[in-house]
Amino acid sequence: KLLQVSTIAMQQQEKLIQQERALLNFTEWKRSCALQMKYCQAFMQNSLSSAHNSSPCPNNWIQNRESCYYVSEIWSIWHTSQENCLKEGSTLLQIESKEEMDFITGSLRKIKGSYDYWVGLSQDGHSGRWLWQDGSSPSPGLLPAERSQSANQVCGYVKSNSLLSSNCSTWKYFICEKYALRSSV
């Protein structure tokens, strides 16, 4: 009889341990769900506020036609400048026309004055051809004035109303570009 009671007690204890384990798993699952819910809510909130503001460009970016531009407040070498732009979902400035060049240089005059700003232009070491980062060639009127006698890689930058070239490892400000959001209204 005593052995029977002891067996039942052990079975009950085993059951209790299993239930505690299940409860622990459930609590962990609940916590994980709550955490995911938090992420979801934050994401939704973000999306909703973006949609509500529906500004074509983010804060501190300048709009011109279909593009948004960010003029950096820090110096960096060309490659780091590119990474900084990518972190914000943009690329270094790619100037498509004289009109765009005029807008950029005009805006820079108002904002900062005569400084150097990296753009997304670099010179192929083998062919010597100037190419934008997407692989396209600049239009003839938008080729950098030859100024760099560097043996290192050469990249393009804007200063005043000119497109110039310099060793990519020098420190300059930079300009990022992304597409402006179209208004859905």
């Epitope: 990474e83 990518l86 690329t91």
Partner: nanobody, 115 residues
């Protein structure tokens, strides 16, 4: 945190092609752009190609016209199509996710091009 898993590396002859894939998981909504870096022995890691969420592209000079970056948002995958491979393309290729807070890298996949 974003998790990145590369595949598709291997040993090829000069002039041949390879396609690298990178599957992205985790907090993918925080990603603003995706890219591929490479690092050859004794050299610095360099950004080979990148694509923003808007589809803006960027390539290093040495691969322009040979490599193409693309992404499949539905499959959370980024690709690097590498054509006309050269021995100097030999390196470990790393997938990268660009976020405002920084850059996350995968573990890398080895690409070896023999002459």
């Amino acid at each position: 945190q974003v998790q990145l898993q590369e595949s598709g590396g291997g040993l090829v002859q000069a002039g041949e092609s390879l396609r690298l894939s990178c599957v992205v998981s985790g907090r993918t909504f925080s990603i603003n752009a995706m890219g591929w870096y490479r690092q050859a022995p004794g050299k610095q890691r360099e950004l080979v190609a990148a694509i923003t969420n808007q589809g803006r592209l960027s390539y290093v000079d040495s691969v322009k016209g040979r490599f193409t970056i693309s992404r499949d948002n539905a499959a959370n995958t980024v690709y690097l199509q590498m054509n006309s491979l050269k021995p100097e393309d030999t390196a470990v290729y790393y997938c990268a996710a660009f976020q405002s807070s920084g850059i996350d890298w995968g573990q890398g996949t080895q690409v070896t091009v023999s002459s």
